[in-house]
């Protein structure tokens, strides 16, 4: 089943968010992902825990799953590059570059997004957009365009509250409000972009979603800047 | 056409409170967040907060933790900011504004109310 | 905190000519940057977002440009409509801040 949901948001305006990716196996989304260079994608490692015997494919340039559009384009995935130190049994470190069999097709719809390098945390209060096309509410429903949520940041303490994630959240990551609206496990690899920098990458975790006690978790890419310059290099 | 409308002036005593309305119209009020700013006379802008309707989630800049408390009638589409024990110093022009949505995340305030006065005076 | 320091406070200029005013953030704001008209007794006017785009109804005489921590707004043939207050705010973490303003009047 596809790993991950926006609930609470809306309707992503068609191709305004160029970087963004579908992560599929054998042709059905599975989790997000962001295009952070013209050959590497930017998910979460345990969208391919599952994967082994499928076939992973990245969509670029694409609003609509369905729907013939003149951007959009399928790339078979050359090498898959999880964290080396992503496990399954915990949220920490679980990101993943997909190298593409060749170099994206750029223009309007399909374009990398600026990284965050600076490692310091994003302001609580600032308001960040998530986006993917995971399913919309809590009877599964899944949306063929893609949908976004503008979600505030929480502040590592109160996401570390015994009543949230109770210190689960280290400095790598970080935490988004979640009070009805939401990404999940299925967004998973998706962007959290902040001010057109990206910011964060929605882990895979298994968490209840829509919950406001249980905040969105995501993985810090200014934490991982060491490591995604040497994969990418 | 999008609409903020908020209340008329206010004079008001000392350690008093006072709420101050902001009525929206033409769009769907759930889906867009409210800021506040403070203008004193001949001042600049300060940003108080926001509040998303959709949820009742609020935000606040530090300094005004304590003096504003910012809340919503979904019914009527009504954002209110309540401020509390007034003094001085709290004499300004307040605006809400919605903030709009531009791209993928970029955002900015895009229709503001009219500002509503408040004297704080004995 | 961000600081935006924003020059000049005030400008004396006739209608015909062109302004340029500045802002300068105290650290890099990735061009989360709008520009605000206000004239006297009125509320704020959204100018410009994201540091260079036009926002809906804005007359082309006006545009942003800049990045990273410096940023301006120039008017060319400044019409008279044009004399008021502007102020630059960021959208860079929290809280928003504001610009202390430039004052244009007429010369």
């Known amino acids: 089943p596809p790993r991950g949901r926006i609930l609470g948001g809306r309707e992503a305006e068609a191709h305004a968010r160029p970087y963004m990716a579908s992560v599929q196996l054998n042709g059905a989304h599975l989790c997000g992902g962001v295009l952070v260079a013209e050959q590497w994608v930017l998910s979460a490692a345990h969208c391919l825990e599952d994967a082994a015997d499928g076939k992973v494919q990245v969509l670029l340039g694409a609003h609509s799953l369905s729907q013939p559009e003149p951007s959009k384009r399928l790339y078979d995935v050359l090498r898959a590059v999880p964290h080396p130190d992503s496990q399954p049994d915990t949220i920490d470190h679980d990101l993943l570059l997909l190298q593409l069999s060749e170099k994206a097709t750029l223009g309007p719809a399909v374009r990398p997004l600026p990284w965050q390098r600076v490692d310091r945390d994003v302001a609580p209060g600032t308001l960040c957009d998530v986006a993917g096309w995971g399913i919309v509410n809590h009877a599964g429903r899944r949306p063929d365009s893609l949908q976004h949520v503008l979600l505030p940041v929480l502040d590592r303490a109160t996401c570390n509250r015994r009543t949230h994630h109770d210190g689960a959240i280290t400095e790598r990551l970080m935490c988004a409000e979640s009070n009805r609206r939401d990404s999940c496990k299925g967004d998973s690899g998706g962007p959290l972009v902040c001010g057109g920098v990206l910011e964060g990458v929605v882990t895979s975790g298994s968490r209840v979603c829509g919950n406001r006690k249980k905040p969105g978790i995501y993985t810090r890419v200014a934490s991982y800047a060491a490591w995604i310059d040497s994969v990418l290099a | 056409q999008v609409q903020l409308q908020q209340s008329g002036p206010e004079l008001v005593k000392p350690g008093a409170s006072v709420k101050i309305s902001c009525k929206a119209s033409g769009y769907t009020f759930t889906d867009y967040y409210i800021n506040w700013m403070k203008q004193r006379p001949g001042q600049g802008l300060e940003w108080i907060g926001w509040?998303?309707?959709?949820?009742?989630?609020?935000y606040y800049n530090e300094k005004f933790k304590g003096k504003a408390t910012l809340t919503v009638d979904k019914s009527s589409s009504t954002a209110y900011m309540l401020l509390s024990s007034l003094t001085s110093e709290d004499s300004a022009v307040y605006f809400c504004a919605r903030l709009g949505y531009y791209s993928h995340s970029y955002y900015a305030m895009d229709y503001w109310g009219q500002g509503t006065s408040v004297t704080v005076s004995s | 905190d961000i600081q935006m320091t924003q020059s000049p406070a005030s400008l004396s200029v006739s209608t015909g000519e062109t302004v340029t005013i500045t802002c300068r953030a105290s650290e890099n704001i990735y061009s989360n940057l709008a520009w605000f008209q206000q004239k006297q007794g009125k509320s704020p006017q959204l100018l410009v977002y994201a540091a260079t785009n036009l926002a809906d109804g804005v007359p082309s005489r006006f545009s942003g440009s800049g990045s990273g921590t410096q940023y301006s707004l120039k008017i060319t043939s400044l019409q008279s409509e044009d004399f008021g207050s502007y102020y630059c705010?960021?959208?860079?973490?929290?809280?928003?801040?504001f610009g202390a303003g430039t004052k244009l009047d007429l010369k």
């Open positions: 509040i998303f309707p959709g949820s009742d989630s609020t």
């Open positions: 705010q960021h959208f860079w973490g929290t809280p928003l801040t």
